[in-house]
Amino acid sequence: AKLGAVYTEGGFVEGVNKKLGLLGDSVDIFKGIPFAAPTKALENPQPHPGWQGTLKAKNFKKRCLQATITQDSTYGDEDCLYLNIWVPQGRKQVSRDLPVMIWIYGGAFLMGSGHGANFLNNYLYDGEEIATRGNVIVVTFNYRVGPLGFLSTGDANLPGNYGLRDQHMAIAWVKRNIAAFGGDPNNITLFGESAGGASVSLQTLSPYNKGLIRRAISQSGVALSPWVIQKNPLFWAKKVAEKVGCPVGDAARMAQCLKVTDPRALTLAYKVPLAGLEYPMLHYVGFVPVIDGDFIPADPINLYANAADIDYIAGTNNMDGHIFASIDMPAINKGNKKVTEEDFYKLVSEFTITKGLRGAKTTFDVYTESWAQDPSQENKKKTVVDFETDVLFLVPTEIALAQHRANAKSAKTYAYLFSHPSRMPVYPKWVGADHADDIQYVFGKPFATPTGYRPQDRTVSKAMIAYWTNFAKTGDPNMGDSAVPTHWEPYTTENSGYLEITKKMGSSSMKRSLRTNFLRYWTLTYLALPTVTDQEATPVPPTGDSEATPVPPTGDSETAPVPPTGDSGAPPVPPTGDSGAPPVPPTGDSGAPPVPPTGDSGAPPVPPTGDSGAPPVPPTGDSGAPPVPPTGDSGAPPVPPTGDSGAPPVPPTGDAGPPPVPPTGDSGAPPVPPTGDSGAPPVTPTGDSETAPVPPTGDSGAPPVPPTGDSEAAPVPPTDDSKEAQMPAVIRF
């Protein structure tokens, strides 16, 4: 069966029907359907006016305008808001009421595209394998990134979050139109990785998406990750304004000037330094989402009630921090270079700057405890990776899972740890699953390009597609049309259970309490440390080119996690079980919840980089030479050669780009207040809203207030002798 021309709100569209095998199955593929009008710089997206005739939707459209990997030129286009759809078809009747999975790509909110990195015409985010193996509709789309997607003055002049609003427009378009493609508009699952995983999380929390999203999957990124929310957008807006010659004294004049500046100049005015960093990449974040008082009405920690009815999977890769650690400390990947205590202490102190000397020392002591028994370089390097994995990914993800669980009514919560090791041969053997290593398996690359992979990789891919698509169908990763290797139990605050995804999965893959002593440390001990306000605690921006200037964390405001407001439904921290490692006793009378103990976490794998972040797909054959990086719009990472290649594959370049950089410190600029009176829902903006906003929980524009004794969210009674406590909002470093 095949769809032929499909009528959408914009008009008729015609894709391509691709036959699969000899049994008559096929997949209808639509590429390049507009879901919004061509964008205007630094303006909200607007609906597409439509077209006459039948639109031929047969080729991917250009990505949104962004800097190339070398950051000296741009590629892509301002006219970029297009989506792509894969619809599986059986032999006889056209598909109906299929679950819908919408992918949101990562790339540090700075780069990426809906089709992903390309090698030999194989696009990373090609939805065919997921669609046909899982019998679901897959949708991918472009959204604006970098300054054009996220520049903000922190007020109504340039509220920001344009890229998030693009994402929302795509979701709302799918809701209105997917039935015509055979999809069930009442069963939409968002999934995404890194900045895409954080975007998924933010979309579930935004009042604009009420009623649009049924389920969500965040891979290596959640709204609470420290690199997701920019607390000082005005600082970065001024940096760009200075670069392009706009006045910075008056925000309104600056905004008007920026809107009429060449978008390419705006894009190139922000560069992420990738070498010789004076501070961790964390401090160089520029253009990411903001709390605008409208689309993101309050700190994400206070918005979890908005996601209470959405089934949720969240997880990380066991060495998600590897790529970042190797940028912050290049010795990590060099066998002949050593990591010293001084190096690590310096790194720790830069991450814990707002807690001053005590923060650095305590954190250093906790992480180096194993160094006395095992002073090997491998152990030290793993420690650095674990530290960045914890801070940037694991701890925020655990808090997000606990928040979701505590607010959820009938909705389910599931946690995972992806531990299938990286296939990048240039990495040391101890490296586990790096950032973005999971993507290739979710998108079925071991099946799409089988010569580049081993049977064990296909085992992992088959399992992930089965869990992900079952979840999209039923809300339970175990139930659906696809067999799974072992039962994945829901995450609860009692068990803190997570599934470890490896090549050999069985009943022992269900584990509990991941890295509890470290989770406990961050949410209890570290939080309770006093925040320092003296000048020494503030990093001095490096001199030289402004693009390398980190935002100094300011004062003590918001650096420590703030407990959620009264009825935010902030969950208590899951009680700990019998953790293998003794929890670090909290200092002081911390209001933060105890963290569950870790189980037997296993060594984490490391993911590849790339627009996708996904690991490169190896070329077929046993190439004797390293693959040449692809050219063109793809910017995709090359694929490592298979077989007994004489040379190691070239590490992926292209739109992999820098990993997402977490924002630091607190914003000097207040969030844009919601329109109307804060208890009421924000007034729906004209044009792009697409969904009536739900009133933000709590006092939207204002900083969260610590809950009072009779907070309506009753904490779950902790087990053992842990103190009853509220989960912290977000750990700010």
Partner: antibody, heavy 119, light 105 residues
Framework: QVQLVQSGAEVKKPGASVKVSCKAS????????MHWVRQAPGQGLEWMGV????????SYAQKFKGRVTMTRDTSTSTVYMELSSLRSEDTAVYYC????????????WGQGTLVTVSS | DIQMTQSPSSLSASVGDRVTITCRAS?????LNWYQQKPGKAPKLLIY???RLPSGVPSRFSGSGSGTDFTLTISSLQPEDFATYYC????????FGQGTKLEIK
């Protein structure tokens, strides 16, 4: 100027079929989608489906799938709507309407064709 | 299908009055169109894309809204404005509101 002229009123028995025509003039026939909308006596408007006269692509409202067929004849700039298995509740005025621009604002309407289904 | 709910279903007003008709969509929509229909006649496009007026439509008609809530406003009623008004959403399966009959008081 744009004109849409529909065929005359019809009286049909239950179970029969009716075919209503809509002749377009004053514009390039193949450049704009044509929709069919009906209105039962004293009731509101109900969208039935759309045809692209350029390539003949059609889309029908779920309610009418299996009973309605829309076709076009580019040589005479005419679109047709055939509704089968008629029942008394199909008694209505049937309108053809052309897109105004872009998609779906129905900017130009035929005068309507009354179809009465009665035994 | 997307549901469109118009209110009021009927209203009485006098020449010169300012009149507002609302249309609520569930779930949210991108654009809304408004039509005017007089007895025995075909509907006429009044406003498209939420707020735009086709040529020939008097400027006393205006439209606004986004997401789920939309309004049609007639700033100063004229005798020829007494008619039935319909809203319509565009999606892959367009639907109309049930209509608002505007009568002379």
């Amino acid at each position: 100027q744009v004109q849409l002229v529909q065929s005359g009123a019809e009286v049909k028995k239950p179970g029969a079929s009716v075919k209503v025509s809509c002749k377009a003039s004053g514009y390039t026939f193949t450049s704009y989608n044509m929709h069919w909308v009906r209105q039962a006596p004293g009731q509101g408007l109900e969208w039935m489906g759309v045809i692209n006269p350029g390539d003949g692509a059609t889309s029908y409202a779920q309610k009418f799938k299996g009973r309605v067929t829309m076709t076009r004849d580019t040589s005479t700039s005419t679109v047709y709507m055939e509704l089968s298995s008629l029942r008394s509740e199909d008694t209505a005025v049937y309108y053809c309407a052309r897109d105004y621009y872009g998609s779906s604002p129905l900017g130009y309407w035929g005068q309507g064709t009354l179809v009465t289904v009665s035994s | 299908d997307i549901q469109m709910t118009q209110s009021p279903s009927s209203l009485s007003a006098s020449v010169g009055d300012r009149v507002t008709i609302t249309c609520r969509a569930s779930p949210s929509i991108s654009y809304l169109n408004w039509y005017q229909q007089k007895p025995g006649k075909a509907p006429k496009l009044l406003i498209y894309a939420t707020s735009r007026l086709p040529s020939g439509v008097p400027s006393r008609f205006s439209g606004s809204g986004s997401g789920t809530d939309f309004t049609l406003t007639i700033s100063s009623l004229q005798p020829e404005d007494f008619a039935t008004y319909y809203c319509q959403q565009r999606s892959s399966s367009p639907t109309f509101g049930q209509g608002t009959k505007l009568e002379i008081k």
